[in-house]
């Protein structure tokens, strides 16, 4: 025979074809072997010109031999080489599908691989590719879009060889709150890590605001609006600065009175204050908290105390905000000026969390009177808020 070729090569099959001998022959003897694969020999009829090779090993170079037989006579042997395809991974499945995450799992191919190419594509045409290592059989997809159909495909790699792709289709869960109006809604969407998030005032996507969410304290879902921790930020700022907000939301900052007014106008909110000093901790929670608008000079409402820090905010209830350049307190002197801070001063304060960091002079420092008095500046303080009915919302989500 002559012209031995292989066609239709897959990971486990190939078709051998040849030109027949000129003379009439009784049979053809076909043998094939690969590295680490024992030789297989088959005899076929002399009028056959092709033979299907099956049960081949994937990603293996085979040597194929064929000769003709007529009676006791044997023709010379002709040889061809071919390499089987890399077999595909199997059983690609998407599990633990959430609004923005999913877990892909698969079974490895029989052949050894140098890695996998994962491709996932949303219906809007957004395509992402990632290469993972050879020992990996699962991969967590993140930053997916909620309520979106995805096609995930996987292909095994072995050097230059690539398997066929297999695919699975899944749909992410719709967000409970596509435009969360506070950190509690972000949390109910499944975000449970403290850090920076975008919220949307009144759920309006045009009213985006970056906030720091505390997702751990007492069940989480808190918008942090004040943090003192190291004294790097200057809190002796004017009215305009306190209205707008200032600082780094990962470090020391004030979120801004305008933002507090807009957030607390969305519904009934509670206030939590966390204090830490030399290993001691204390907290105060007020189940009613709101900040009025600029016309009221950001009037404070704070009621319904519980906690361990002592009810120091009660003294400030009903007061307007004061800064050194806008004195709205009830003192003859300017409290903000006297105590180098800003707050809902009265005459003057039980709480001075925007006071001078580290200043232990009477009433000048970061004070919470009913915890550490006025002659001790507290090392760490955070003020934060979340909806008063958060516990009910959380319970509803868990049942769902």
């Amino acid at each position: 025979p002559s012209g031995l070729v292989t066609a239709n090569i897959t990971d486990s099959e190939a078709l051998a074809r040849w030109q027949p001998a000129i003379a009439t022959v009784d049979s053809y003897v076909i043998s094939y072997t690969g590295e680490k694969v024992p030789e297989i020999t088959r005899t076929v009829s002399g009028n056959t010109v092709e033979y299907a090779l099956t049960d081949l090993e994937p990603a293996t170079e085979y040597t194929l031999r064929i000769f003709a037989e007529k009676g006791p006579q044997k023709s010379s042997t002709i040889t061809a080489k071919f390499t089987t395809d890399l077999d595909s991974p199997r059983d690609l499945t998407a599990t633990e599908v959430q609004s923005e995450t999913a877990l892909l799992t698969w079974r490895p191919p029989r052949a050894s691989v140098t890695g996998y190419l994962l491709v996932y594509e949303s219906v809007d045409g957004t395509v992402k590719e990632v290469i993972v290592g050879p020992d990996t059989t699962s991969y967590s997809l993140a930053d997916l879009s909620p309520s979106t159909h995805y096609t995930a495909k996987i292909q095994a790699l072995n050097g230059p060889l690539r398997s066929n792709m297999i695919q699975t289709i899944f749909t992410t869960i719709g967000l409970l709150y596509p435009f969360p109006k506070d950190c509690s809604q972000a949390m109910l969407n499944g975000d449970t890590t403290s850090g920076l998030y975008t919220i949307y005032l009144n759920g309006d996507k045009a009213e985006a605001l970056e906030v720091f969410c505390d997702m751990t304290s007492d069940g989480g879902g808190w918008i942090v609006f004040l943090r003192r921790k190291n004294g790097r930020e200057n809190f002796y700022q004017n009215w305009k600065a306190y209205a707008a907000g200032f600082g780094d939301r990962r470090e020391e900052f004030w979120l801004g009175l305008d933002n507090l007014n807009k957030i607390t106008a969305q519904g009934q909110y509670e206030l939590r204050v966390d204090l830490r000093d030399h290993g001691e901790t204390a907290f105060a929670v007020y189940d009613k908290f709101s900040v009025g608008d600029a016309k009221t000079r950001y009037k404070l409402k704070v009621e319904g105390y519980s906690g361990t820090a002592g009810d120091s905010m009660a003294y400030h209830n009903g007061r307007s905000f004061s800064t050194f350049d806008k004195d709205t307190d009830s003192a003859i002197t300017n409290c903000a000026l006297s105590y180098k801070g800003a707050f809902w001063y009265r005459n003057c304060h039980r709480v001075n969390l925007m006071g001078r960091y580290g200043d232990n002079n009477h009433s000048q420092g970061v004070n919470w009177f009913h915890w550490k008095g006025h002659e001790h500046s507290i090392q760490f303080a955070e003020m934060k808020l979340r909806p008063s009915n958060f516990r009910n919302l959380e319970g509803r989500r868990k049942r769902a």
Epitope: D311, A314, Y315, H316, N317, G318, S330, A331, I332, T333, R346, N347, C348, H349, R350, H362, S363, H374
Partner: antibody, heavy 120, light 107 residues
Framework: QVQLVESGGGLVQPGRSLRLSCAAS????????MHWVRQAPGKGLEWVSG????????YYADSVKGRFTISRDNAKNSLYLQMNSLRAEDTALYYC?????????????WGQGTMVTVSS | DIQMTQSPASLPTPVGDRVTITCRAS??????LNWYQQKPGKAPKLLIY???NLETGVPSRFSGSGSGTDFTLTISSLQPEDFATYYC?????????FGQGTKVDIK
């Protein structure tokens, strides 16, 4: 109008007990801290005890700590002072006083007082 | 406890005169100071809270000032109905303490 009316005073022997009451009207009682302040005959004012709006927190002057107990019944708009182990120096006119909104340590409404005389 | 010291103890004053009563705290109390008026046989009445704020219904001839440890109650022009005993009270810390009183009587 806002009103506080004390009752329960009288003559009592040293070591005995007495319970003072204060009936409040004209305001949302459980929104406010309430206090007892006393005035010995011909003397100045002395704060005795205070209680938060919910009744969850109570405070006492050192001179009465361990002997007097302040309490309130918000359903009845009433404030009480249970006085045990009475001494001659507890003789005074006892005023019930309403705290202002907020901390409640400023007394904006006072009753007319009830006289307690401790004498053998 | 915070001691409150009032002076003078007694202040004979003619009608129409200006009256000044001082009150000193034994420690710094910001503006946590109140003034009360008590007439014979009557309960005390709140006049000034937070050192300088006039209680509703109190005539404007009464005023308060001061911060920290030193405070003053002023009656700009003494009227016959103002003859009474005046007490300062600190609301800075428990126990809330009163001054010993200043008796303003007719000269």
């Amino acid at each position: 109008q806002v009103q506080l009316v004390e009752s329960g005073g009288g003559l009592v022997q040293p070591g005995r007990s007495l319970r003072l009451s204060c009936a409040a009207s004209g305001f949302t009682f459980d929104d406010y801290a309430m206090h007892w302040v006393r005035q010995a005959p011909g003397k100045g004012l002395e704060w005795v005890s205070g209680i938060s709006g919910s009744g969850g927190s109570t405070y006492y002057a050192d001179s009465v700590k361990g002997r007097f107990t302040i309490s309130r019944d918000n359903a009845k708009n009433s404030l009480y002072l249970q006085m045990n182990s009475l001494r001659a120096e507890d003789t005074a006119l006892y005023y019930c006083a309403k705290g202002t909104r907020g901390e409640g340590d400023t007394f904006d409404i006072w009753g007319q007082g009830t006289m307690v005389t401790v004498s053998s | 406890d915070i001691q409150m010291t009032q002076s003078p103890a007694s202040l004979p004053t003619p009608v129409g005169d200006r009256v000044t009563i001082t009150c000193r705290a034994s420690q710094y109390i910001q503006g946590f100071l109140n003034w009360y008026q008590q007439k014979p046989g009557k309960a005390p009445k709140l006049l000034i809270y937070d050192a300088s704020n006039l209680e509703t219904g109190v005539p404007s001839r009464f005023s308060g000032s001061g911060s920290g440890t030193d405070f003053t109650l002023t009656i700009s022009s003494l009227q016959p109905e103002d003859f009474a005993t005046y007490y300062c009270q600190q609301s800075y810390s428990t126990p809330q303490t009163f001054g010993q009183g200043t008796k303003v009587d007719i000269k």
